[in-house]
Interface confidence: low
Amino acid sequence: MRTEAQVPALQPPEPGLEGAMGHRTLVLPWVLLTLCVTAGTPEVWVQVRMEATELSSFTIRCGFLGSGSISLVTVSWGGPNGAGGTTLAVLHPERGIRQWAPARQARWETQSSISLILEGSGASSPCANTTFCCKFASFPEGSWEACGSLPPSSDPGLSAPPTPAPILRADLAGILGVSGVLLFGCVYLLHLLRRHKHRPAPRLQPSRTSPQAPRARAWAPSQASQAALHVPYATINTSCRPATLDTAHPHGGPSWWASLPTHAAHRPQGPAAWASTPIPARGSFVSVENGLYAQAGERPPHTGPGLTLFPDPRGPRAMEGPLGVR
């Protein structure tokens, strides 16, 4: 049986919030609590953007904030993959990328983030309230999925700009000694809590847990903390899912040779426009699912030939070939 633990993702600060400094003393303990609980816990962020130039064109960007190695990324729409969602793209760090209409261009932006451009018209066109989900399978963390959609009132071409991440990427955390800072923060938090002992503590709501408890990990937060931070898994039902895709793949994956566009995919003409790794922008909602490999029945990542990183981000395929320069 698959074990799922719901963990809230950290949202970026809302731009233009006034009086934030005045509330710092109230906010600080909760920020520290969140950091203490989520320390070492992977996060997935999703950003959905509608292009101003083409109203039926969407850009989905997803990233994994974790220290593990990513073995597979699955992008779906209409709900989480395996729960009514339709697969749009599968990105494997060693073995390539598969995409299905209306996905136009799926690519790696960094070792831990991907982007996907969708375009379409009529039945295969995404619409404003479509839910897009990204699932990152990593080792040893397991599978983590996040979903996002455009905010209802969003203007074409506008989504919250990727905010510089207020939290450090987990793979850099160890290097930068964030663990020490968090430890200090946790101690400070305990100190604050002891000072405010006289205040009644908010009652914890029991969390929805699956029958099988998650396998314990050294950095796993306590049950109480998990309960305190638990958020329900949110998905948006949409009427925009393409019937053409649903009928094309009764077995879960579309018949890619039947549904793919015949024209060549448009390629970005340069390195990724987004240099920093953002966390979810406004208008995106995030939910995270964790399934350990042993429990989810997933494979550990394949270890193939030694991989090398290349200075030219476009690679040789910008001008030629399936094996070379396009």
């Epitope: 760090p93 799926a106 793919l260 015949t262 060549a264 090398t308 200075p311 030219d312 070939g321 070379g324």
Partner: antibody, heavy 125, light 112 residues
Framework: QVQLVQSGAEVKKPGASVKVSCKVS????????MHWVRQAPGKGLEWMGG????????IYAQKFQGRVTMTEDTSTDTAYMELSSLRSEDTAVYYC??????????????????WGKGTTVTVSS | DVVMTQSPLSLPVTPGEPASISCRSS???????????LDWYLQKPGQSPQLLIY???NRASGVPDRFSGSGSGTDFTLKISRVEAEDVGVYYC?????????FGGGTKLEIK
């Protein structure tokens, strides 16, 4: 570990078609980029075509354009290569091979790192 | 198409001795990112080909370190520092810079 299991030997008459299958195990087909390579008796290797993940399309070598069709059944994790209008010079061993992927990012470079055992196709009248 | 030419056609070697196979391409396989898009494969008798070297000089997983690839542009070499009996077979170079990828004619390594 990826494994590719190919269908058995075929004997065909000139003008007929042959469909060779390649079953993937250890991974799902959607995680791989499948290529097909053939080898005529006593001759070298010849790339016929393969899946191009950047386009999401299959690309065929010019020589086989119009005669070859490469398809996949994701429900059974099986890839197929169909060659039509067979001639005697199509007598060969046909291999399926997965295209390895070197590095993430916007970089797509392929090498055939896992091969099937091959399917012998004999075209004879 | 890029034409790949291998030499020698046949290479008899004594076990323990070194061996060298040459591969020449009709156009440069060096791309602006500094990589040479050339791979080496070995096809042992009665078997499928197996990847030995990719990107000119990178050994594939599980390949013994007695195999090494070198060269740049149009001239490439596969070296075996000490040939063993299990190394017999036909060695192919393949260019991966342009579509379609093309293979050399092969070099048959045999034990003396």
């Amino acid at each position: 570990q990826v494994q590719l299991v190919q269908s058995g030997a075929e004997v065909k008459k000139p003008g007929a078609s042959v469909k060779v299958s390649c079953k993937v195990s250890g991974y799902t087909l959607t995680e791989l980029s499948m290529h097909w390579v053939r080898q005529a008796p006593g001759k070298g290797l010849e790339w016929m075509g393969g899946f191009d993940p950047e386009d999401g399309e299959t690309i065929y070598a010019q020589k086989f354009q119009g005669r070859v069709t490469m398809t996949e059944d994701t429900s059974t994790d099986t890839a197929y290569m169909e060659l039509s209008s067979l001639r005697s010079e199509d007598t060969a061993v046909y291999y399926c091979a997965t295209g390895g992927y070197s590095s993430g990012f916007n970089y797509y470079y392929y090498y055939m790192d896992v091969w099937g055992k091959g399917t012998t196709v004999t075209v004879s009248s | 198409d890029v034409v790949m030419t291998q030499s020698p056609l046949s290479l008899p070697v004594t076990p323990g001795e070194p061996a060298s196979i040459s591969c020449r391409s009709s156009q440069s396989l060096l791309y602006r990112n500094g990589n040479n898009y050339l791979d080496w494969y070995l096809q042992k008798p009665g078997q499928s080909p197996q990847l030995l070297i990719y990107l000119g000089s990178n050994r594939a997983s599980g390949v013994p370190d007695r195999f090494s690839g070198s060269g740049s542009g149009t001239d490439f070499t596969l070296k075996i520092s000490r040939v063993e009996a299990e190394d017999v077979g036909v060695y192919y170079c393949m260019q991966a810079l342009q579509t379609p990828p093309t293979f050399g004619g092969g070099t048959k390594l045999e034990i003396k």
